[in-house]
């Protein structure tokens, strides 16, 4: 694979990763597609420090991250272990709420206006954050 040694134009470097912050909204799957086409992934939050960095850049706006439970258990898009990893859910979240009337529950995680996480309907058109690691040979993700 190829190695990225510096961040692309319009991306922000932080702690050896590059971040791109959208200014408009898409459904979770389409945001995921966008990041993958840019050889990145929806942001994976692994520490409080990274949480604060992302939160600072997105402001008080609902924003998708790379965490979902569309196939059962909660999973990070890059394979980072969810159970042992960093979490920042709002109280009583995730709740897989069915009361929204849109069909099904809530399978995709997003930053809320205070930065804490909530699960929501994946079709909602929220902003999103892409992340790619520097100095890391690009992997071959599964065919989408």
């Amino acid at each position: 694979g190829s190695e990225r040694t510096c961040c692309p134009v319009n991306w922000v470097e932080h702690e050896r990763s590059c971040y791109w912050f959208s200014r408009s909204g898409k459904a979770w799957a389409d945001a995921d597609n966008y990041c993958r086409l840019e050889d990145a992934h929806l942001v994976v939050v692994t520490s409080w420090e990274e949480q604060k960095f992302v939160q600072h850049h997105i402001g008080p706006v609902n924003t998708w991250m790379g965490l979902h439970d569309q196939n059962g258990p909660w999973k990070w898009v890059d394979g980072t272990d969810y159970e042992t990893g960093f979490k920042n859910w709002r109280p009583e979240q995730p709740d897989d709420w069915y009361g929204h009337g849109l069909g099904g529950g809530e399978d995709c995680a997003h930053f809320t206006d205070d930065g804490r996480w909530n699960d929501d309907v994946c079709q909602r058109p929220y902003r999103w954050v892409c992340e790619t690691e520097l100095d890391k040979a690009s992997q071959e993700p599964p065919l989408l």
Epitope: S24, D30, Y34, R36, D39
Partner: antibody, heavy 122, light 107 residues
Framework: EVQLLESGGGLVQPGGSLRLSCAAS????????MSWVRQAPGKGLEWVSA????????YYADSVKGRFTISRDNSKNTLYLQMNSLRAEDTAVYYC???????????????WGRGTLVTVSS | EIVLTQSPATLSLSPGERATLSCRAS??????LAWYQQKPGQAPRLLIY???KRATGIPARFSGSGSGTDFTLTISSLEPEDFAVYYC?????????FGGGTKVEIK
């Protein structure tokens, strides 16, 4: 000069295979996602497939999924489309196109090749 | 998938006239919409992206507007070289889709 040049089109029988190539020049090829778009004779445009800059992520229209494979060789600045199990309805001009990004998070075709004609007929 | 419907299919106008082309989406595409121009025997060319932003080198007589489901491409005063087919394209939802096109012909 910034350009894309397709090749490899031609006449093929139904069920046959063909490999299209697209040679890129004038820009940092490996930094951009690329795509194939086709246009049947006298018809509109149809997106076919896309691939990320590294080649790690690929996408296909349902009409070609399982039959077409997009790939790239960044050392040769070349994009490919392997087309198998061809059908009459695959007859079209195939365009190679560069996918530009926007600050809002859109992907648009900001550079096109001149196209190569693929005819599927017995 | 999102269906883009362009109207009219054909627009017959004279040089110097104003052209107004419509693109309607089957569901909201926010502002993720582009317009392309295609002349006979040539590849398409990007005119407008993000619904209203002109691509590099595109004359100011081309303008785009709209958001959600209804979009418009306006050519303020048609030049002889503007007679062509125009396509809209959305990148809000996978797969990328194009409209069926509007042909602007000389009256």
């Amino acid at each position: 000069e910034v350009q894309l040049l397709e090749s490899g089109g031609g006449l093929v029988q139904p069920g046959g295979s063909l490999r299209l190539s697209c040679a890129a020049s004038g820009f940092t090829f490996s930094s951009y996602a690329m795509s194939w778009v086709r246009q049947a004779p006298g018809k509109g445009l149809e997106w076919v497939s896309a691939i990320s800059g590294s080649g790690g992520s690929t996408y296909y229209a349902d009409s070609v999924k399982g039959r077409f494979t997009i790939s790239r060789d960044n050392s040769k600045n070349t994009l490919y489309l392997q087309m198998n199990s061809l059908r009459a309805e695959d007859t079209a001009v195939y365009y190679c196109a560069k996918l530009g990004t926007t600050v809002s998070g859109g992907h648009y075709f900001d550079l096109w090749g001149r196209g190569t004609l693929v005819t599927v007929s017995s | 998938e999102i269906v883009l419907t362009q109207s009219p299919a054909t627009l017959s106008l004279s040089p110097g006239e104003r052209a107004t082309l419509s693109c309607r989406a089957s569901q909201s595409v926010s502002s993720y919409l582009a317009w392309y121009q295609q002349k006979p025997g040539q590849a398409p060319r990007l005119l407008i992206y993000d619904a209203s932003k002109r691509a590099t080198g595109i004359p100011a007589r081309f303008s785009g507007s709209g958001s959600g489901t209804d979009f418009t491409l306006t050519i303020s005063s048609l030049e002889p070289e503007d007679f062509a087919v125009y396509y809209c394209q959305q990148d809000s939802n996978h797969p990328l889709t194009f409209g069926g096109g509007t042909k602007v012909e000389i009256k």
